[in-house]
Interface confidence: low
């Protein structure tokens, strides 16, 4: 009769994460007498996952009876796949001996592969404010797929992104996998409403990438464009000079008014106005008393927008002219202004 | 008797592309993988595509590290053909391209048989030329 | 990778083993008499021989090494020998050949 041979028909075997693998294994013989154990890995260090004889396996089935004599089919399925459990388990016929059993034939392996779905990305941005024309750097990382093939995408606002640099870990062999991934954007004027998308795409997806999403509102800030104007005259002897705070995010602001150089007024910005990219606009203004100057007033509006140095912006107004004669030419009345900005 | 016949070949210009296609008889072609090999002049031979029986989307088709982003590699399963199509052909595309039968194929979930490993039956190759 | 010798020899009637190592689990081994030629399978899948293969063609694995053994090499033997295998994304690689000469 011909010798006893051990057929693992499966080279591989794929399976998705949570379910049940079948590994198959079949006798083409009854003789030798002796059980079949399956082990994952060769060598010493091999893993036992099923013993026929004795043991306690509460993950593994037979697919077949195997107490019935004539049984050939040796095949086994293991429970709640998990990535852990990859490898290559192989079939391993005993032949009855004593005090031991010993090692007859093993059939030539089926490595098993566990397809686990990567996480959510998780997108996480700079930890600090920054103003347009900065480059910024966002992170995404996902964690725990296999096998270790993925792609990797970023947008911004649906637009692909291309500078950036992933790396998927280990660089060896794994049970499962990481993908970090850091893109570099160019911030705008315009981003308060911008979105940056990480976009991971893996074969346990079927087609359906999972995404990652931060907000550029977060990661912004837009500096402010200050205005001060005199307006018209409203009582004989009382000019009204405004600060008009433009296109500023976040809307966080402190404003302080200063005559000659004396703090007059300080105010946080409360009812502002949004505009459509997102930014805002705000206004103060500052009732001036002539009268109560022998000399010309250097007035000036100074902002502290969301922790930064302050901002200002002066106008000159010349108490000599009488009130009704200076009327709202800001351009006349700005010379010699002084504009200081500081970022 | 098992046969495959390339046909395809013969003088590319460079930038261009190329569509191979291999008649396989003498065998149930949907049960079986098959793949290209090529082989550059006075060179070995280099693992170009190779297309799988199961519909599993992971292992339904693979390419050389040569060709990946460039090649296209589909099958016919009713005229019994596996085409290779290659884009922005250079000189190092110059060779024969063989058409190779695997001894298995793939279901859904496992396979008996790969591709370079398994190979059991080679196309007599077709000549492709790449110059200006 | 796969690593196999760049050159063999042995005279008629002896016996010649090949070898070639990497990390796949299967092998074949492919004969090619002159370049441009349909190479022949020999071994698929690591021991299995094609119908019409001489029974001195063999194929073993130990380990991460596969060797193929020609018993009683003939003269008609001359000629690059190629293992193939997968990597792990079932990639195909083949080794860069072995070239036998019978002296």
């Known amino acids: 009769e011909e010798e006893l041979q051990v057929i693992q028909p499966d080279k591989s075997v794929l399976v998705a994460a949570g379910e049940t693998a079948t590994l198959r294994c079949t006798a083409t013989s009854l003789i030798p007498v002796g059980p079949i154990q399956w082990f994952r890995g060769a060598g010493p260090g091999r893993e036992l996952i099923y013993n026929q004889k004795e043991g306690h396996f509460p993950r593994v089935t037979t697919v077949s009876d195997l107490t019935k004599r004539n049984n050939m089919d040796f095949s086994i399925r293991i429970g709640n796949i998990t990535p852990a459990d990859a490898g290559t388990y192989y079939c391993v016929k005993f032949r009855k001996g004593s005090p031991d059993d010993v090692e007859f034939k093993s059939g030539a392996g089926t490595e098993l592969s566990v397809r686990a779905k990567p996480s959510a990305p998780v997108v996480s941005g700079p930890a600090a404010r920054a103003t347009p024309q900065h480059t910024v750097s966002f992170t995404c990382e996902s964690h725990g797929f296999s096998p270790r093939d993925i792609t990797l995408k970023w947008f911004k606002n649906g637009n692909e992104l291309s500078d950036f640099q992933t790396n998927v870990d280990p660089v060896g062999e794994s049970v499962s996998y990481s993908i970090h991934s850091t893109a570099k954007v160019v911030l705008t004027r315009e981003d308060v409403h911008s979105q940056v998308i990480c976009e991971v795409a893996h074969v346990t997806l079927q087609g359906d990438p999972l995404r990652g999403t931060a907000n550029l509102s977060e990661t912004i800030r837009v500096p402010p464009t200050l205005e001060v104007t005199q307006q018209p005259v409203r009582a004989e002897n009382q000019v009204n000079v405004t600060c008009q705070v433009r296109k500023f995010y976040p809307q966080r602001l402190q404003l302080t008014w200063l005559e000659n150089g004396n703090v007059s007024r300080t105010e946080t910005a409360s009812t502002v106005t949004e505009n459509k990219d997102g930014t805002y606009n705000w206004m103060s203004w500052l009732l001036v008393n002539v009268s109560a100057h022998r000399d010309d007033v250097k007035l000036t509006c100074q902002v502290e927008h969301d922790g930064q140095p302050a901002v200002s912006k002066s106008h000159d107004l010349k108490v000599s002219a009488h009130p009704k004669e200076q009327g709202s030419n800001t351009a006349a009345e700005n010379t010699g202004s002084n504009e200081r900005n500081i970022y | 008797a098992v046969t495959l016949d390339e046909s395809g070949g013969g003088l590319q210009t460079p930038g261009g592309a190329l569509s191979l296609v291999c008649k396989a008889s003498?065998?149930?072609?949907?049960?079986?993988?098959m793949g290209w090999v090529r082989q550059a002049p006075d060179k070995g031979l280099e693992f170009v595509a190779g297309?799988?029986?199961?519909?599993?989307?992971?292992?339904?088709?693979t390419y050389g590290a040569a060709v990946q982003g460039r090649a296209t590699i589909s099958r016919d399963n009713g005229q019994s053909t596996v085409r290779l199509q290659l884009n922005n052909l250079g000189a190092e595309d110059t060779g024969i391209y063989f058409c190779t039968k695997s001894a298995g194929g793939c279901s859904d979930y496992n396979c008996d048989a790969y591709i370079a490993d398994s190979i059991d039956a080679w196309g007599h190759g077709t000549e492709v030329i790449v110059s200006s | 990778a796969v690593t196999q010798p760049a050159s063999v020899s042995a005279n008629p009637g002896e016996t010649v083993k090949i070898t070639c190592s990497g990390s796949?689990?299967?092998y074949g081994w492919y004969r090619q008499k002159s370049p441009g030629s349909a190479p022949v399978t020999l071994i698929y899948d690591n021991d299995k021989r094609p119908s019409g293969i001489p029974s001195r063609f063999s194929g073993s694995k130990s380990g991460s090494t596969n060797t193929l053994t020609i018993t009683g090499v003939q003269a008609d033997d001359e000629a690059v020998y190629y293992c193939g295998n997968e990597d792990n994304s079932y990639v195909g690689i083949f080794g860069a050949g072995t070239t036998l000469t019978v002296l």
């Open positions: 796949s689990s299967y």
């Open positions: 003498g065998f149930t072609f949907s049960s079986y993988n």
């Open positions: 297309i799988y029986t199961g519909s599993d989307a992971g292992l339904s088709t």
